[in-house]
């Protein structure tokens, strides 16, 4: 006879799966906060900074009541993919001033990538419909100046921090509904 069958596959507890995703998101939120503070210390921001290529905010107090797990995970994954792309672009094209944020910016990129893989895994474990592969995004234009790179960094880290902050709250809320 062939090898004995392996142990029965235990279906994962969705709350536990979501818990570990919340932990990762919280951890990345803390990393982003520290890096944004570091950026502000080195290059104080004068007013607000926007970048048209960044995703628009997906969550607010009013949206919390109608949250559904598939929608939240799909949107969060799409937004974080965009931020990952922007962080990669920042490291490549941000100019010499932003090299002072290494290796922290590289660590942030790696952790963002890890959270994205965790979200992908969570979606497959919960048997949620997988989003279609992302269409190739148009390349981001290099900053027009060193100051342009710094302004972009403020916008990217600020936007990522806000997205992660709402993500933690949304995921915590969804956990209670499972």
């Amino acid at each position: 006879p062939g090898p004995p069958p392996g142990p029965p596959r235990v279906s994962p507890d969705p709350r536990a799966e979501l818990d570990s995703t919340v932990l990762l998101t919280r951890s990345l939120l803390a990393d982003t906060r520290q890096l944004a503070a570091q950026l502000r210390d080195k290059f104080p921001a004068d007013g607000d900074h926007n970048l048209d290529s960044l995703p628009t905010l997906a969550m607010s107090a009013g949206a919390l009541g109608a949250l559904q797990l598939p929608g939240v995970l799909t949107r969060l994954r799409a937004d974080l993919l965009s931020y990952l792309r922007h962080v990669q672009w920042l490291r490549r094209a941000g100019g010499s001033s932003l090299k002072t944020l290494e290796p922290e910016l590289g660590t942030l990129q790696a952790r963002l990538d890890r959270l994205l893989r965790r979200l992908q895994l969570l979606m497959s474990r919960l048997a949620l419909p997988q989003p279609p592969p992302d269409p190739p995004a148009p390349p981001l234009a290099p900053p027009s100046s060193a100051w342009g790179g710094i302004r972009a960094a403020h916008a990217i880290l600020g936007g990522l921090h806000l997205t992660l902050d709402w993500a933690v709250r949304g995921l915590l809320l969804l956990k209670t509904r499972l």
Partner: antibody
């Protein structure tokens, strides 16, 4: 630097109205939900209500429902609190505060509202 | 009567560690993030801890937060005279559909 500056407080008679403003600067106002909170003299903090970043949703504490209205003008980076049918127990320092998720990460310095005849 | 329950006062001597408790229910602390605010005399409140145990930038790591079930606590180690203030816990409440606070704890540094 994030700054929130309340104005419009003062002395008003019971049953009267008052409109508070909160001028925001140093951040992208239109990205953040905004709140009003209050603190009666010598008492604790009390949440009044929240308005979503795009003004599409508002939530209020039970004690102000139907009397207070929160609004915002994103083009002017300003938050408002319209207070009607004021009572003596509404006497408090009123604060505006920014919400990035579940918490209030920046607060204004507050404006005092006194309801008395 | 506040929805979240805190001791009205706490005290300690410089260098000591003090803990402030905050208890609630499943509709607030049990299901939602707990935040802590510090209010120095005559000033506006300031965020001290968010999402149960995260520190905003600029807050010294002498401050820490924790949560278990429907209770949370704030710990301050290496107490300093400038820590003398009112401390408030807060959370969203699913039943009330709003933010609730504890009554505040007045911390005295002896």
């Amino acid at each position: 630097e994030v700054q929130l500056l309340e104005s419009g407080g003062g002395l008003v008679q019971p049953g009267g109205s008052l409109r508070l403003s909160c001028a925001a600067s140093g951040f992208t106002f239109s990205h953040y939900d905004m709140n009003w909170l209050r603190q009666a003299p010598g008492k604790g903090l009390e949440w009044v209500g929240v308005i979503s970043y795009d003004a599409s949703n508002k939530f209020y504490a039970d004690f102000v429902k139907g009397r207070f209205t929160i609004s915002r003008d994103n083009s002017k980076n300003t938050l408002y609190l319209q207070m009607n049918s004021l009572r003596a127990e509404d006497t408090a320092v009123y604060y505006c505060a920014r919400t990035p998720g579940s918490h209030f990460d920046y607060w204004g310095q507050g404006t005092l509202v006194t309801v008395s005849s | 009567q506040s929805v979240l329950t805190q001791p009205p006062s706490a005290s300690g001597t410089p260098g000591q560690r003090v803990t402030i408790s905050c208890s609630g229910s499943s509709s607030n602390i049990g299901n939602n993030a707990v935040n802590w605010y510090q209010q120095l005399p005559g000033t506006a409140p300031k965020l001290l801890i968010y999402y149960d145990d995260l520190l905003p930038s600029g807050v010294p790591d002498r401050f820490s937060g924790s949560k278990s079930g429907t209770s949370a606590s704030l710990a301050i180690s290496g107490l300093r005279s400038e820590d003398e203030a009112d401390y408030y816990c807060s959370a969203w409440d699913d039943s009330l559909n709003g933010v609730v606070f504890g009554g505040g704890t007045k911390l005295t540094v002896l």
